[in-house]
Interface confidence: low
């Protein structure tokens, strides 16, 4: 959780002098309760907005809006504490509106907004607005909370934000997998416009089984700028294992902002059609039994060799 760096947030408006301050989420009025405290916010609304940073990056932000109740307690309203809690991490970030002048009338309904909390795709937040000072112990609560779910990167507007784009939302590798002679697969995919490496994980399975019988990891070094958006062709040599005929090719990019967590794309080659009367299979060890070796991936040895080149 963080705050937008630009432009500087403003809470002052006609008839009110106000400044926005960072907050520890522990207002002084918790520790030193006051006798008279304001009523709670009214009509708290949270919407998804989008904002550019000073560098021009586009981020999703929580647009927080609320109004004041039309009662006399505004005479005791000294400000507000805005808190955003990310529910899956319990991380909390707060800011404080500090009123530098008193509110003395309701000629028009007082309305406040804040759009500087940067939020993440596919995350849920609890947004709370506390009027200050906070209530005395056992006093009526003077805050309002709402949950806010940020859409994931499938959302048309989210897709073009910096966090989504950097996790690969715009990358369409358009994978093709072709079976060649001599137990080989040719994998072709489109490189993205970033000098970052890729990994291809080939996982093979017996027909109608979910235990892998062959796994092979292939590393593709970072392309040069002139290779961006070009097709990369990789030839993978398969282990000639009986019945190990269904192959899943998964491509994992390592874009700078998502590192190990980038969106992966995959393609599958099915087993060839089985003949009506299958030939008897000789006795053999289970194909998925691990073999000794230094690789993290079973059966990932010299027989799973590969080579690649970029096609312009």
């Amino acid at each position: 959780l963080r705050l937008l760096d630009f432009p500087a947030p403003v809470c002052a408006q006609e008839g009110l002098s106000c400044r926005v301050k960072n907050s520890t989420c522990l207002d002084d009025s918790w520790i030193h309760p006051r006798n008279l405290t304001p009523s709670s916010p009214k009509d708290l609304q949270i919407q998804l907005h989008f904002a550019h940073t000073q560098q021009g990056d586009l981020f999703p932000v929580a647009h927080i809006e609320w109004t004041l109740q039309t009662d006399a307690s505004i005479l005791y309203l000294e400000g507000a504490e805005l808190s955003v809690l990310q529910l899956n991490t319990n991380e909390r970030l707060c800011v404080r509106f500090e009123f530098l002048s008193k509110l003395r009338h309701h000629h028009r309904r007082w309305r406040f907004t804040f759009s500087h909390f940067v939020v993440d795709p596919d995350q849920e937040y609890e947004v709370t607005v506390h009027h200050l000072p906070k209530p005395i112990p056992d006093g009526d609560p003077n805050h309002q909370s709402k949950n806010f779910l940020v859409p994931d990167c499938e959302h048309a507007r989210m897709k073009v934000t910096t966090p989504c784009m950097s996790s690969g939302s715009l990358w369409d590798p358009n994978i093709t997998v072709e079976t060649l002679e001599a137990h080989q697969l040719r994998v072709s995919f489109t490189l993205w416009n970033e000098s970052t490496h890729y990994q291809i994980l080939l996982t093979s399975f017996p027909h109608m089984e979910n235990h892998s019988c062959f796994e092979h990891m292939h590393h593709i070094p970072a392309p040069r700028p002139e290779e961006f958006h070009q097709r990369s062709n990789v030839t993978l040599t398969l282990r000639n294992l009986k019945g190990c005929c269904r192959h899943q090719v998964q491509i994992q990019p390592f874009f700078s902002s998502c590192l190990n967590d980038c969106l992966r794309h995959s393609a599958t080659v099915s087993c060839p059609e089985m003949p009506d009367t299958p030939e008897p299979i000789p006795d053999y060890m289970p194909l998925w039994e691990p073999r000794s070796g230094s690789s993290d991936y079973k059966d990932d040895d010299d027989k799973g060799s590969s080579h690649h080149h970029h096609h312009h």
Partner: antibody
């Protein structure tokens, strides 16, 4: 091919709960969220909520908040929708659908009848 | 919430004719709009997403247009299998909302 297969029809008494399942196949379950939509007899479609199969995040329709719970079991690629404190106006066909925003594949629907 | 209004409620068209269905949003939904077709006893079938992109396997006679608040689904030449109820749905903001539907019936 992508398929969403839902559990069978249910008849419930007012005040009871119902749990509808939706088993997905033909794609990587955790890649797309599951949404739930219901349709009362002779009426239009009503969005109930969504669950992220990856993070478990949920978003429920305001009117169902507190009565509905959506969950997933990634080991079986199954999504569940539980609705509690059933009322007669909850009588509807309940659909699961793939994706968070627009729905590209739908289950066949589960008729839930609430009657005393 | 964003209210989606479809018109007309019922459209009577002869086979081979052109059908134009309208969907209006109470506020702008950009191009985040989908159209579905539903026949009695069946689940809805996706036709269009992002206002104008045809879903997989949808015939070219179906086309979507519009952005902001006004959207149109056009069926250029109605086939017998096209008589059904059509729903629009916005996914620009929570909660997701559907229109009330337009029933396309044989004239």
């Amino acid at each position: 091919q992508v398929q969403l297969v839902q559990s069978g029809a249910e008849v419930k008494k007012p005040g009871a709960s119902v749990k509808v399942s939706c088993k997905a196949s033909g794609y990587t379950f955790t890649r797309y969220g599951i949404s739930w939509v219901r349709q009362a007899p002779g009426q239009g479609l009503e969005w109930m909520g969504w669950i992220s199969t990856y993070s478990g995040n949920t978003n429920y329709a305001q009117k169902l908040q507190g009565r509905v719970t959506m969950t997933t079991d990634t080991s079986t690629s199954t999504a569940y929708m539980e609705l509690r404190s059933l009322r007669s106006d909850d009588t509807a066909v309940y659909y699961c659908a793939r994706r968070q925003l627009y729905f590209d594949y739908w289950g066949q629907g589960t008729l839930v009848t609430v009657s005393s | 919430e964003i209210v989606m209004t479809q018109s007309p409620a019922t459209l009577s068209v002869s086979p081979g004719e052109r059908a134009t269905l309208s969907c209006r949003a109470s506020q702008s939904v950009s191009s985040n709009l989908a159209w579905f077709q539903q026949k009695p006893g069946q689940a809805p079938r996706p036709l269009i997403y992002d206002a104008s992109t045809r879903a997989t396997g949808v015939p070219a006679r179906f086309s979507g247009s519009g952005s902001g608040t006004d959207f149109t689904l056009t069926i250029s030449s109605l086939q017998s299998e096209d008589f059904a109820v059509y729903y629009c749905q916005q996914y620009d903001n929570w909660p997701l909302t559907f229109g009330g539907g337009t029933k396309v019936e044989i004239k």
